[in-house]
């Protein structure tokens, strides 16, 4: 049974040109994490393994750090980097968590963040 | 340098049994998920079994589930298929792979043929 | 079982040429999709994970693209070498499923 909850950053805001910590956080479950990819809509943006530790898809690599922690930072951010991502914790035995973000990339300095909020 | 190795292949009656293994070294290999994938002859690839780098969770083929399990020996470098009741339709060319953040194959061994005849 | 449909199932090339081979899922892999390169009595050789990432050592003149369904493999300028099947494969899921292959045979 699966009784773990995944804890996100939520909606959240931030300025063209800036930078953003997409950040989840798996409670609730003594599970083990094994990994976790983010990922942007349709594409795979980097995976921190517990083994192997971090891989950044080589055409983000200019422009995703990892962490911190099991975190991504998204850099040099512009208005197409506007949308959804998801962070999704293998864990074991578990199973699969998975977490959303949405992301506004705004042209204006009046970028605030949002509430954090939880997915079961 | 990464090197995949396997033994164990031959042939075999129908019903019979056989156990594949797979000797790694160049890398970590308690770090890596490893997998089979076969290749039946003129015919293209697929995927057999599955197992995570602490052995802890394996996945299998509909085809393979119940008569192939897969294990592996950290301490010896060494991924294993242990495969019963084997039909002719199991004679292929076994391949074992080491997969990185179980999303692509990397490296692959050069095979072991197992044919299953009368 | 996600389905990987890969067509076209043969091509006939020269060398010099450009040539497109594409992969359908059954159903969204994200971008959860590679690319392998096998030659006669060899083991199949990563080119593409990911999607669109070149593995390291692979010639430039290969290159993926797509997300959600539909993949496609280019090889910009068709080399000698390059004669040989490919297949796609997804990891979106267990099962992984590969495509039938294409073969690549000289003109």
């Known amino acids: 049974m699966m009784t773990g909850t995944i804890e996100t950053t939520g909606n959240i805001s931030a300025e063209k040109g800036g930078s953003i910590i997409l950040q989840c956080h798996l409670s609730s479950t003594t599970a083990q994490v094994t990994q976790v990819n983010w990922e942007q809509q349709d594409q795979l943006l980097a995976i921190c393994n517990a083994d192997l530790g971090w891989h950044i898809s080589p055409s983000f690599k200019d422009r995703v750090a990892p962490g911190p922690g099991l975190g991504l930072t998204l850099q040099s951010l512009t208005v197409n980097d506007t949308g959804e991502y998801f962070c999704i914790y293998h864990t074991y035995p578990d199973g699969t968590y998975t977490g959303r973000i949405f992301l506004e990339v705004l042209e204006s300095s009046v970028a605030e963040h949002g509430a954090r909020f939880q997915i079961p | 340098e990464v090197q995949l190795l396997e033994s164990g292949g031959g042939l075999v009656q129908p019903g019979g049994s056989l156990r594949l293994s797979c000797a790694a070294s160049g890398f970590t290999f308690s770090s890596y998920a490893m997998h089979w994938v076969r290749q039946a002859p003129g015919k293209g690839l697929e995927w057999v079994s599955g197992i995570s780098s602490n052995g802890g969770s394996t996945s299998y083929a509909d085809s393979v589930k119940g008569r192939f399990t897969i294990s592996r020996d950290n301490s010896k470098n060494t991924l294993y298929l242990q495969m019963n009741s084997l039909r002719a339709e199991d004679t292929a060319v076994y391949y074992c792979a080491r997969v990185p953040y179980a999303v692509w194959i990397d490296y692959w061994g050069q095979g072991t043929l197992v044919t299953v005849s009368s | 079982d996600i389905q990987m449909t890969q067509s076209p199932s043969s091509l006939s090339a020269s060398v010099g040429d450009r040539v497109t081979i594409t992969c359908r899922a059954s159903?969204?892999?994200?971008?959860?999709l590679n690319w392998y390169q096998q030659k006669p009595g060899k083991a199949p050789k990563l080119l593409i994970y990911?999607?669109?990432s070149l593995q390291s050592g692979v010639p430039s003149r290969f290159s993926g693209s797509g997300s959600g369904t539909d993949f496609t493999l280019t090889i910009s300028s068709l080399q000698p070498e390059d004669f040989a099947t490919y297949y796609c494969q997804q990891s979106y899921s267990t099962p992984l499923t590969f495509g039938g292959g294409t073969k690549v045979e000289i003109k």
């Open positions: 159903q969204s892999i994200s971008s959860y």
């Open positions: 990911a999607a669109s």
